[in-house]
C-alpha cells in the first residue's frame, strides 16, 4: 500500500507512517513504529501540555509571584497552566497577567464610569454639567448637583465639575 501523505485527527505523520499524538497532560517519549504504539509519559511536577501533541518536553507552569502583586486564581494541572490574578485594588498589566499595577483613581472633576476589575483598569469620565466630583477615587461616580429648589432654597454659588452648588435662603420681600 502507498504510504500516507496525511493522517487522521490526533495523529501525525512520521517516517511515512501515521502515529497517535500524545493526549493533553502527556509528552512524547518515542514515535510509533510498524510494530509499536506511540509512547507517551505524563508531564511532571509544575508542568503541563494543553493540547494533543508530539512535544518531548512539557511546558512549565506559571507561578503567581506575590512580589508582582499576583495571586493564584487556579493552580496548574498536567493539562492546564496556572491562572494568576491580581490582589484586591490591582489589575493585570497584560492579557497574560504577568504583573499587576494599582487601579488608577479618577481625579476631582472626573467620576468612575467603570470600576476596575482584576484584568481592567478604572475608566474615568469628565463630570458633565449638573454633576461634580470633589475627591480622587477609584469608586466614586460623579454626583448630581444639589437641587436647591426642592429644598425651597436658591442657588447662592453655582456648581462646577469639582464642586456642588451652594444653596441659601430665598430673599423675602418685606411688606
Amino acid at each position: 500500500p502507498e504510504p500516507p501523505t496525511a493522517c487522521r485527527e490526533k495523529q501525525y505523520l512520521i517516517n511515512s507512517q501515521c502515529c497517535s499524538l500524545c493526549q493533553p497532560g502527556q509528552k512524547l517519549v518515542s514515535d510509533c513504529t510498524e510494530f509499536t504504539e506511540t509512547e507517551c509519559l505524563p508531564c511532571g511536577e509544575s508542568e503541563f501540555l494543553d493540547t494533543w501533541n508530539r512535544e518531548t518536553h512539557c511546558h512549565q507552569h506559571k507561578y503567581c509571584d506575590p512580589n508582582l502583586g499576583l495571586r493564584v486564581q487556579q493552580k496548574g494541572t498536567s493539562e492546564t497552566d496556572t491562572i494568576c490574578t491580581c490582589e484586591e485594588g490591582w489589575h493585570c498589566t497584560s492579557e497574560a497577567c504577568e504583573s499587576c499595577v494599582l487601579h488608577r483613581s479618577c481625579s476631582p472633576g472626573f467620576g468612575v464610569k467603570q470600576i476596575a476589575t482584576g484584568v481592567s483598569d478604572t475608566i474615568c469620565e469628565p463630570c458633565p454639567v449638573g454633576f461634580f466630583s470633589n475627591v480622587s477615587s477609584a469608586f466614586e461616580k460623579c454626583h448630581p448637583w444639589t437641587s436647591c429648589e426642592t429644598k425651597d432654597l436658591v442657588v447662592q454659588q453655582a456648581g462646577t465639575n469639582k464642586t456642588d452648588v451652594v444653596c441659601g435662603p430665598q430673599d423675602r420681600l418685606r411688606a
Partner: antibody, heavy 120, light 106 residues
C-alpha cells in the same frame, strides 16, 4: 506570611504506625500540591509523594507505596503523612514541602521537619 | 525512575576559588532545581528551573544545562557557601534528588 508548622518528634516502636501533620498558614493548601520528603541521618533527600488537596489525588514513589499514605484536610489547611509497619529504616526527618503557586517559584517553603525515631 | 548522579560527592574549595558541581540525569529532563542545606536546617531552594536564583541567593551563584547535563557554579567561593547541594528533577514522577555534594571550605 507563609508558615508551615509540622508536628513534634515521635519515638515509636518497630511495627507501629505514626501520623505526622503539617499545618499551613498564610496560604490555602488547595492552591498547592503538598509533598513529603524523607532524610535519613547523614543521608540525602528522598521524595515520598504528594497530594493535590483540592481533589485528594496522590502520587507516590513506588518504593514508598504501601509504607506511606498522604492525606489532606482542607478545612484545617493541614496535610498528613502516615507511615505504617515501622522499622529502623524509617528513622528519619520528614519534611512537608508545598509546591505553592502563589510563591515566586517552586518549593519556596519547607517545613521545619519532624524527627521520627523507631526504636524498641 | 530518572536517576541523578551528582559529582563530586565531596569537595573543598578555597575562598575566591571557582566551584562547579554537576548533575547528570539518566534520561532527558526539562529543567533542574538545586537546593542548599546546612546541618540541622531544612533545605532551601537555591536555583530553580535550571538557571534562576531564588531570592536572597548571591549573584556569584549560577545554574545552567539542558537534557541530561546540568551544573551549579560559584564564581568565587565564600565561607558562607559551605553546605550540601542537591539537584532535583521534576520532569517525571517519581521526583528524584541527586545524592548531594558536600562543599567544604579549604
Amino acid at each position: 506570611e507563609v508558615q508551615l508548622q509540622q508536628s513534634g518528634a515521635e519515638l515509636v516502636k518497630p511495627g507501629a504506625s505514626v501520623k505526622l501533620s503539617c499545618t499551613a498558614s498564610g496560604f490555602n493548601i488547595k492552591d498547592s500540591y503538598m509533598h513529603w520528603v524523607k532524610q535519613r541521618p547523614e543521608q540525602g533527600l528522598e521524595w515520598i509523594g504528594r497530594i493535590d488537596p483540592a481533589n485528594g489525588n496522590t502520587k507516590y514513589d513506588p518504593k514508598f507505596q504501601g509504607k506511606a499514605t498522604i492525606t489532606a484536610d482542607t478545612s484545617s489547611n493541614t496535610a498528613y503523612l502516615q507511615l505504617s509497619s515501622l522499622t529502623s529504616e524509617d528513622t528519619a526527618v520528614y519534611y512537608c514541602v508545598p509546591n505553592y503557586y502563589g510563591a515566586a517559584y517552586p518549593f519556596a517553603y519547607w517545613g521545619q521537619g519532624t524527627t521520627v525515631t523507631v526504636s524498641s | 525512575d530518572i536517576v541523578l548522579i551528582q559529582s563530586p560527592a565531596i569537595m573543598s574549595a578555597s575562598p575566591g576559588e571557582k566551584v562547579t558541581i554537576t548533575c547528570s540525569a539518566s534520561s532527558s529532563v526539562s529543567y533542574m532545581h538545586w537546593f542548599q542545606q546546612k546541618p540541622g536546617t531544612s533545605p532551601k531552594v537555591w536555583i530553580y528551573s535550571t538557571s534562576n536564583l531564588a531570592s536572597g541567593v548571591p549573584a556569584r551563584f549560577g545554574g545552567s544545562g539542558s537534557g541530561t547535563s546540568y551544573s551549579l557554579t560559584i564564581s568565587r567561593m565564600e565561607a558562607e557557601d559551605a553546605a550540601t547541594y542537591y539537584c532535583q528533577q521534576g520532569s517525571s514522577y517519581p521526583l528524584t534528588f541527586g545524592a548531594g555534594t558536600k562543599l567544604e571550605l579549604k
